[in-house]
């Protein structure tokens, strides 16, 4: 099984023990590590994003001297990059060709084994351009193989939301040109629903409405397969972060009304999102519940509510992906797991390690 783990370059800016650099990654933890994110320059070439990306690329790829089987990929795009710029590049032959031709030399120069596309998210008019972009990247990667130089890997991070899938992806077409698909089976539930809910339930909940039946890992995986994605190329996304809400009343169960996103974490400083190492802290004195249908936990403390993953829930998810004969798991993100071993002393990356152990 593959265990594909994302590293985020901005995690270096978190304060104190929250700061994370690639050399903190255990070399044998994951089979593939994806560095997020690279940029695309004004002349449509793959390029660095952070001032010290080159140094961090080097730190990441040095892990391969210890684990020679480790593969590294560079992810291009992301939320800040936006879908508009991707659309401008993919929809124009000249721009798209310039980008496609720039990718392999860039990856080779910095020691990466492949590219991950994080176009978040293609709109209806971009659907065919996204397919074309993937097809052309794969063709370029095939063409540039030479003895002593293996073919570069190509993956894509795809939304697990039904609307986004139907709108932006021709699954049958893109799946044949990708080595694997990173299915983002999280962020299913958010503040827009105005009630509490887990953002990555394995199965549909008993109380779920008609729309909610799409908002779970099981549905997304089965739907992708139905649309033509080979199970052997699908990686099920498992989050090491939780989604939090501020409760609107004393009601604190699943489906309780909310007034907004949860308070920002001490280190991640983003309302509505908590790293696992922040959740550990939150759990002290909190009320913990396990959703029997959804197979995931949530916790409440005061007016704060958080849906998250623990060792038990990730093991359940791995059991599911094995049953469905998927390619493996994807983790977002290493820097949001307890990489310092603060939850339980000397236990580093507990969630990712639990996934690794369950995959074995």
């Amino acid at each position: 099984y593959k265990l594909v783990c994302y590293f985020t370059s901005w995690s270096q800016y978190r304060e104190g023990v929250g700061s994370f650099l690639p050399d903190a990654i255990q070399p044998f933890l994951c089979t593939h590590i994806i560095y997020s994110f690279a940029n695309i320059s004004s002349d449509n070439m793959l390029s660095t994003w952070e001032w010290n990306d080159e140094s961090n690329y080097d730190k990441l790829n040095k892990l391969k001297t210890r684990n020679t089987n480790l593969k590294t990929l560079l992810s291009v795009g992301g939320w800040k990059f936006g879908e508009k710029r991707f659309s401008e590049i993919a929809s124009n032959t000249e721009r798209r060709t310039a980008f496609v031709r720039s990718v392999a030399p860039f990856l080779r120069s910095y020691g990466f084994d492949g590219l991950d596309l994080a176009w978040l998210y293609p709109r209806l008019r971009d659907k065919q351009y996204f397919s074309t972009l993937i097809k052309e990247l794969n063709a370029e990667f095939t063409k540039e193989v030479q003895p002593g130089r293996e073919k570069l890997l190509l993956s894509a991070a795809l939304s697990a939301g039904k609307v986004a899938i139907d709108t932006g992806y021709d699954i049958a077409q893109i799946a044949q040109h990708l080595d694997f698909i990173n299915l983002m089976t999280y962020d299913f539930h958010g503040v827009w629903r105005q009630i509490t809910g887990h953002h990555s339930p394995l199965f549909q909940g008993q109380k779920d409405t008609r729309f909610d039946r799409y908002s779970n890992v099981n549905y997304a995986v089965q739907y992708m397969i139905r649309l033509g994605a080979q199970a052997s190329k699908l990686l099920m996304g498992i989050p090491t972060f939780g989604k939090s809400f501020t409760l609107a009343s004393s009601e604190n169960q699943l489906g309780a009304p909310i007034s907004g996103e949860g308070l920002p974490g001490r280190f991640t400083k983003e309302a509505g999102t908590l790293a696992y190492y922040e959740i550990c802290d939150f759990l002290k004195g909190a009320e913990v519940h396990r959703l029997s249908n959804e197979k995931v936990p949530f916790a409440t403390k005061g007016n704060q509510w958080v849906g998250y993953e623990d060792k038990e829930s990730v093991k359940n998810k791995v059991g599911f992906l094995k049953e469905k004969k998927l390619a493996g798991a994807m983790v977002w993100a290493l820097d949001l797991d307890d990489f310092q071993g603060t939850c339980q002393p000397k236990e580093f990356f507990p969630l990712t390690n639990a996934i690794k152990d369950a995959l074995a």
Epitope: S102, P105, S109, Q146, G148
Partner: antibody, heavy 125, light 110 residues
Framework: EVQLVESGGGLVQPGGSLRLSCAAS?????????MCWVRQAPGKGLEWIGC?????????YYADSVKGRFTISKHNSKNTLYLQMTSLRAEDTAVYYC????????????????WGQGTLVTVSS | DIQMTQSPSSLSASVGDRVTITCQAS??????LNWYQQKPGKAPKLLIY???SLASGVPSRFSGSGFGTDFTLTISSLQPEDFATYYC????????????FGGGTKVEIK
């Protein structure tokens, strides 16, 4: 001493054929190497002709200007590289160099670290 | 097909001068750009590989930089033995390649 020595050059008529040899000494043409031919017309710049990947002996790459006319091959036991040239033209007149590329690595790419002294081929009637 | 364009084609300079030669690739080649020095009647000699790595035995007055499509060879203080012709070469691919070398830059005594 590690060196490459070309031979086989000379005067040939247009339409004729010639086989150049490149003998490697001081090292064995190992499986990771690419062995290549580069030429230089009198008073002109360097022009890449083609390469062979020694590891397979079947992976060959040629410039469009010589494709179908020139063939690169190797003889393992003789530690020798060959350039078979057919349908020669006046514009093929040049000094022909044999060069060694140690093989691809992301760290360094392709480059010619070792060159022969060159052999002159003159195509004229 | 990757084309290499070198400029200038020739330049005149004096001993002690700082000399800069540029090379442009028709498409991105990452860091894979090499520089060679050639003297009359001699085979080319590798100076720099992978854009900025100095070949063995090459004096430190030679340096290279660049990434993608634009590259530079700099001789910080020209010495009498540096008067020669310099060639850039893309070191990225042998596939679908027409030449791979730039046209050359002849460095002459002013």
């Amino acid at each position: 001493e590690v060196q490459l020595v070309e031979s086989g050059g000379g005067l040939v008529q247009p339409g004729g054929s010639l086989r150049l040899s490149c003998a490697a000494s001081g090292f064995t043409i190992s499986s990771d190497y690419y062995m290549c031919w580069v030429r230089q017309a009198p008073g002109k710049g360097l022009e890449w002709i083609g390469c062979i990947y020694i590891g397979s002996g079947t992976d060959t790459y040629y410039a469009d200007s010589v494709k179908g006319r020139f063939t690169i091959s190797k003889h393992n036991s003789k530690n020798t590289l060959y350039l078979q040239m057919t349908s020669l033209r006046a514009e093929d007149t040049a000094v022909y160099y044999c060069a060694r590329d140690k093989g691809w690595s992301n760290a360094w790419g392709f480059y010619f670290q070792l060159w022969g002294q060159g052999t002159l081929v003159t195509v004229s009637s | 097909d990757i084309q290499m364009t070198q400029s200038p084609s020739s330049l005149s300079a004096s001993v002690g001068d700082r000399v800069t030669i540029t090379c442009q690739a028709s498409q991105s080649i990452g860091k894979y750009l090499n520089w060679y020095q050639q003297k009359p009647g001699k085979a080319p000699k590798l100076l720099i590989y992978s854009s900025s790595s100095l070949a063995s035995g090459v004096p430190s007055r030679f340096s290279g930089s660049g990434f993608g499509t634009d590259f530079t060879l700099t001789i910080s203080s020209l010495q009498p033995e540096d008067f020669a012709t310099y060639y850039c070469q893309q070191g990225y691919s042998y596939v679908d390649l027409e030449n791979g070398f730039g046209g050359g830059t002849k460095v002459e005594i002013k």
